[in-house]
C-alpha cells in the first residue's frame, strides 16, 4: 500500500493538493494519485502554484529538511516536441484536460533542460531543503524522485465544522490522510473527537443533489457549548470576546442571538443584555467582501480562481453520497486555504463571514450577473 | 469576464433535429457541472438535463420529458456545452439556457446553485 | 415530481410596501432557491439555500421557510424589484421550478 500523504490542501473552488514523500519513478507517482483518485499535479501559475507552495512550506519530509528534494508533478516534453529555449516551460506542457491558460507566472528552471526533439523528457519541481521550491528541473522519467504531488477536484466540499467544545479532533479523509485539521474535506471525510465528559462523536461529510454537509452535525458545532459564546468557532466566555481593537469577536451559541445592545448574547427572543463587550457580532446574514481577513470565519465567498484548473474526478453516484476528495490545511500557524485567500481573493471574508462561491470570473467584480454579462 | 454563448437555435419541423451549443468562458469550464433550462414564449423556467463534471464521470440527469430524445453533453478541452434535440415536438418551442452550476459555502454545508445564465438560444419547431 | 405552487400569480406593489411571495411544494424539500427576471434577459440567482441572499442583491430581500412551505420577502418595494421571481428546488429529479410570480410597481 502506498504511504499516507503527508499534507494536503484544498480551496475552495474544490481542487484539493497532496504532497508524498516517496522514492519512485515517475510511472509510479501517476499510478499512486490515480489510485488515490486523482492525477499527478499540474503545478500552473496563480493560486494553484500557490497552493503547492504552501504544502511545500508546511514542513520538511522524513531527513529533518538537510537535502534538495525532488517532486514529479505532470510536467514533460513530449517525444515530438523540441526545447524551446524562450519559452517560460522550455518547451515542456502540462499534462491535462484543460485548455492552456498563462505560464508566464510559472518557476524558474532550476538547470536549463537538455535541447532534443526526440526523447521524452520529464520534469520535476526541486524543493531546497525539501520545502522552498527552487524550480523546475528535466529528469528522465525512469529515474527516482524523492515524492510526488497529486490533485483531486470535486464539485463540492464540507467546509470544516467549528469544534465548540470538541477536542482531541481527527480528520480521516478518502484518500489516506489523517490531520488534525481541515479547513474543506471532501464527501467521506470523517472527523471524530471527544465532547465534555469524554463522549466521543463522529461526522461524516456526504454530498448529495443539493450540495455537501455533515451528517448527524447539528448547528455546524461538533460539542454544543456550555455557555453563550463562540470565538473562531470554539467556546469562549465574555470577557475573551474582545479583540485586541475593543469590538465584539465572538458569535452567539445555538439558542442565543445578539441582545439589542450589541455587545453580548441573550437566549433567544429574550430582551436586553446586562453584560457586553463593543462592535458587532460574528454572525451575520452573509455577505461579500473585497479584502481577506486570516481568520476563517463563515459564510465566505471566495473567487474561484484559488483552484485553477482541476484534473480530476468528482465521483459521485446520483443522488447518494459521493466518495471525494479533501481540502486540507497544513498545520501551520495559517492554513493554506487562507494563504490562497490572502494572496488571491477578490472576495472574501468578512468578520462575520461572507460568502465563498465556487466562482472563477475574471473580472474583479464577485458580482454573480446573467452568465452572459452583457444582460446582467 | 464570465460567459456563455449559446447558438444552433433556429426554426425547425415536427420529428426534426437541432444541435444547440454554448461557448463558455471565464471560468474553469471542466470543473462545474452544466445544465440547459428552457422557457416557453410567456412561461416559466423548465429545467431540461444536467451533466457532471469529470470528476463525476460525466453524469446526465434529463426531464422526463426529453428523455430518450434529448442528450446533453460537454467537450471540457473546448469548454462547449451541447444538447442534441431529437424527435422535436411542438412543446419543445421555448428559449434554451445553458446554465452553470456554482458551489456557495456557509456554515458547515455546500449548496449547488444555477448561478449563470447563458442569454439563451431561441427553437422553434413549427411545420 | 415535486410541484411548486407560487403565489400570488401576480401582484403590485407600490414603493415602500412590504411584498411576501410564497412558494408551496408538494411534498417536503431541504432548501429552496429563488431567481428574479426582468423582461428579455436571462434569470439570475437571487437567494440560494432557502435564506442567503446572492452577490448584490439589495439587503430589503429575505427568504425563510422549510419544509413545503418558503417565502421571499421585499421588506420595502423599490422600482427596481418589479420582475418576475421563481423558486426553485433540488431535492430530488427532475429540479423543478415554481410558476411564475411577477411582481408590478403600482
Known amino acids: 500500500e502506498h504511504p499516507t500523504a503527508d499534507r494536503a490542501g484544498c480551496s475552495a473552488s474544490g481542487a484539493c493538493y497532496s504532497l508524498h514523500h516517496a522514492t519512485m519513478k515517475r510511472q509510479a507517482a501517476e499510478e499512486a494519485c490515480i489510485l488515490r483518485g486523482g492525477a499527478l499535479s499540474t503545478v500552473r501559475a496563480g493560486a494553484e502554484l500557490r497552493a503547492v507552495l504552501a504544502l511545500l512550506r508546511a514542513g520538511p519530509g522524513p531527513g529533518g529538511g538537510s537535502k534538495d528534494l525532488l517532486f514529479w508533478v505532470a510536467l514533460e516534453r513530449r517525444r515530438s516536441h523540441c526545447t524551446l529555449e524562450n519559452e517560460p516551460l522550455r518547451g515542456f506542457s502540462w499534462l491535462s484536460s484543460d485548455p492552456g491558460g498563462l505560464e508566464s507566472d510559472t518557476l524558474q528552471w532550476v538547470e536549463e533542460p537538455q535541447r532534443s526533439c526526440t526523447a521524452r523528457r520529464c520534469a520535476v519541481l526541486q524543493a531546497t531543503g525539501g520545502v522552498e521550491p527552487a524550480g523546475w528541473k528535466e529528469m528522465r522519467c525512469h529515474l527516482r524522485a524523492n515524492g510526488y504531488l497529486c490533485k483531486y477536484q470535486f464539485e463540492v466540499l464540507c467546509p470544516a465544522p467549528r469544534p465548540g467544545a470538541a477536542s482531541n479532533l481527527s480528520y480521516r479523509a478518502p484518500f489516506q490522510l489523517h490531520s488534525a485539521a481541515l479547513d474543506f474535506s471532501p464527501p467521506g471525510t470523517e472527523v471524530s473527537a471527544l465532547c465534555r465528559g469524554q463522549l466521543p462523536i463522529s461526522v461524516t461529510c456526504i454530498a448529495d443533489e443539493i450540495g455537501a454537509r455533515w451528517d448527524k452535525l447539528s448547528g455546524d458545532v461538533l460539542c454544543p457549548c456550555p455557555g453563550r459564546y463562540l470565538r473562531a468557532g470554539k467556546c469562549a466566555e465574555l470577557p475573551n470576546c474582545l479583540d485586541d481593537l475593543g469590538g465584539f469577536a465572538c458569535e452567539c451559541a445555538t439558542g442565543f442571538e445578539l441582545g439589542k445592545d450589541g455587545r453580548s448574547c441573550v437566549t433567544s427572543g429574550e430582551g436586553q443584555p446586562t453584560l457586553g463587550g463593543t462592535g458587532v457580532p460574528t454572525r451575520r446574514p452573509p455577505a461579500t467582501a473585497t479584502s481577506p481577513v486570516p481568520q476563517r470565519t463563515w459564510p465566505i465567498r471566495v473567487d474561484e480562481k484559488l483552484g485553477e484548473t482541476p484534473l480530476v474526478p468528482e465521483q459521485d453516484n446520483s443522488v447518494t453520497s459521493i466518495p471525494e476528495i479533501p481540502r486540507w490545511g497544513s498545520q501551520s500557524t495559517m492554513s493554506t486555504l487562507q494563504m490562497s485567500l490572502q494572496a488571491e481573493s477578490k472576495a472574501t471574508i468578512t468578520p462575520s463571514g461572507s460568502v465563498i462561491s465556487k466562482f472563477n470570473s475574471t473580472t474583479s467584480s464577485a458580482t454573480p450577473q446573467a452568465f452572459d454579462s452583457s444582460s446582467a | 469576464e464570465v460567459q456563455g454563448v449559446e447558438s444552433g437555435g433556429g426554426l425547425v419541423q415536427p420529428k426534426g433535429s437541432l444541435k444547440l451549443s454554448c461557448a463558455a468562458s471565464g471560468f474553469t469550464f471542466n470543473t462545474y457541472a452544466m445544465h440547459w433550462v428552457c422557457q416557453a414564449p410567456g412561461k416559466g423556467l423548465e429545467w431540461v438535463a444536467r451533466?457532471?463534471?469529470?470528476?463525476?464521470?460525466?453524469?446526465?440527469y434529463y426531464a422526463d420529458s426529453v428523455k430518450d430524445r434529448f442528450t446533453i453533453s460537454r467537450d471540457d478541452s473546448q469548454s462547449m456545452l451541447y444538447l442534441q434535440m431529437n424527435n422535436l415536438k411542438t412543446e419543445d418551442t421555448a428559449m434554451y439556457y445553458c446554465?452553470?452550476?456554482?458551489?456557495?459555502?456557509?456554515?458547515?454545508?455546500?449548496?449547488?446553485?444555477?448561478?449563470?445564465w447563458g442569454q439563451g438560444t431561441s427553437v422553434t419547431v413549427s411545420s | 415530481e415535486i410541484v411548486l405552487t407560487q403565489s400570488p400569480a401576480i401582484m403590485s406593489a407600490s414603493p415602500g410596501e412590504k411584498v411576501t411571495i410564497t412558494c408551496s411544494a408538494s411534498?417536503?424539500?431541504?432548501?429552496m432557491h429563488w431567481f428574479q427576471q426582468k423582461p428579455g434577459t436571462s434569470p439570475k440567482l437571487w437567494i440560494y439555500?432557502?435564506?442567503n441572499l446572492a452577490s448584490g442583491v439589495p439587503a430589503r430581500f429575505s427568504g425563510s421557510g422549510s419544509g413545503t412551505s418558503y417565502s421571499l420577502t421585499i421588506s420595502r418595494m423599490e422600482a427596481e424589484d418589479a420582475a418576475t421571481y421563481y423558486c426553485q428546488q433540488r431535492s430530488s429529479y427532475p429540479l423543478t421550478f415554481g410558476a411564475p410570480g411577477k411582481l408590478e410597481l403600482k
Open positions: 439555500s432557502t435564506s
Open positions: 446554465v452553470r452550476e456554482g458551489v456557495y459555502y456557509y456554515g458547515s454545508s455546500g449548496y449547488y446553485a444555477m448561478d449563470y
Open positions: 451533466i457532471r463534471s469529470k470528476s463525476n464521470n460525466y453524469a446526465t
Open positions: 411534498s417536503s424539500v431541504s432548501y
